[in-house]
């Protein structure tokens, strides 16, 4: 794996970078879960959406997302062909016309109505630094990512590479 | 990186069958789309069949009835069966694939094709 310089040298450029289409490339609902099984949920609270991270019940229904996979604008010194790849980016989506949104000032995740395009807050580029488990590091803040704190979801600074694999940076996505 | 490997062309008989398989390797999240291609000498590239990213499969209207896509995904493997095979029909054989895969744990897309495989269909 590489470390977070050799990340974040690899994921700088996205600050420039802009989206190759406003079509996603595939959609999947998945739900989404922390390393340690808790689910995320998401409730309608007068009128805005609130996310939390919780234990549910035994049969309960786990909430799911909609994940649009969206390829990126490469600098010129990347070809995106089938052997360098197309850097891919995700937009997070639990109900309609509301995607995870982040607030880089506020350091939290929220849910923001939105309109396509959508503005950079609400992409992600997906890293896998742990077996069958993901990270969401945005896409207008390298080196920051989604991550748990205090039972909500919140971005966390990651600043070594051993911190990559932290648990509260860590989540599991399931389509089941 | 990813791979496709192609296996199962070679020499049938007019009316003959084949199968093709084609293997996708390396750090695969997902595999979106996945189907088949040919080109005869002197000729363009043409699609023969392919599953879309829905995973409804889509044929060429000359193969259809005679030819089956099939995909196991927990081998990350496309095949092609091919019967009643016609000599108008020899060609290379292409694998293609849309793979989402991680790349020093960053997950990128690829469009990716395999080696081509000969199929010859003669008496």
């Known amino acids: 794996a590489f470390g977070i310089s050799g990340v974040q040298k690899y994921t700088r450029a996205l600050h420039d970078s802009s989206i190759t289409g406003i079509s996603p490339i595939t959609e999947y609902l998945a739900s989404l879960s922390t390393y340690n099984d808790q689910s995320i949920t998401f409730a309608l609270e007068d009128e805005s959406y609130e996310i939390y991270v919780e234990d549910l019940k035994k049969d309960e229904k786990k909430d799911k997302v909609l994940l649009s996979y969206y390829e990126s604008q490469h600098p010129s010194n990347e070809s995106g062909d089938g052997v360098d790849g197309k850097m891919l980016m995700v937009t997070l989506s639990p109900t309609k016309d509301f995607w995870l949104h982040a607030n880089n000032k506020e350091h939290s995740v929220e849910l923001h109505k939105c309109e396509k395009p959508l503005p950079d807050q609400a992409f992600f580029v997906l890293h896998n630094m742990h077996s069958n488990c993901v990270s969401f590091e945005c896409k207008t803040d390298p080196g920051v990512f989604i991550g748990v704190k205090d039972n909500h979801l919140a971005l966390i600074k990651v600043d070594s590479s051993e911190n990559l694999c932290t648990e509260n940076i860590l989540f599991k996505l399931s389509e089941t | 990186q990813v791979q496709l490997v192609e296996s199962g062309g070679g020499l049938v008989q007019p009316g003959g069958s084949l199968r093709l398989s084609c293997a996708a390797s390396?750090?695969?999240?997902?595999?979106?789309?996945m189907g088949w291609y040919r080109q005869a000498p002197g000729k363009q590239r043409e699609l023969v069949a392919s599953?879309?990213?829905?995973?409804?499969?889509n044929y060429a209207d000359s193969v259809k009835g005679r030819f089956t896509i099939s995909r196991d995904n927990a081998k990350n493997t496309v095949y092609l069966q091919m019967n009643s095979l016609r000599p108008e029909e020899t060609a290379v054989y292409y694998c293609?694939?849309?793979?989402?895969?991680?790349?020093?744990?960053?997950?990128?897309?690829?469009?990716?094709w395999g080696q081509g495989t000969q199929v010859t269909v003669s008496s």
């Open positions: 599953f879309t990213s829905g995973g409804s499969p």
């Open positions: 293609n694939a849309y793979i989402m895969a991680w790349s020093h744990g960053v997950l990128k897309g690829y469009d990716s």
């Open positions: 390396g750090s695969i999240f997902r595999i979106n789309t």
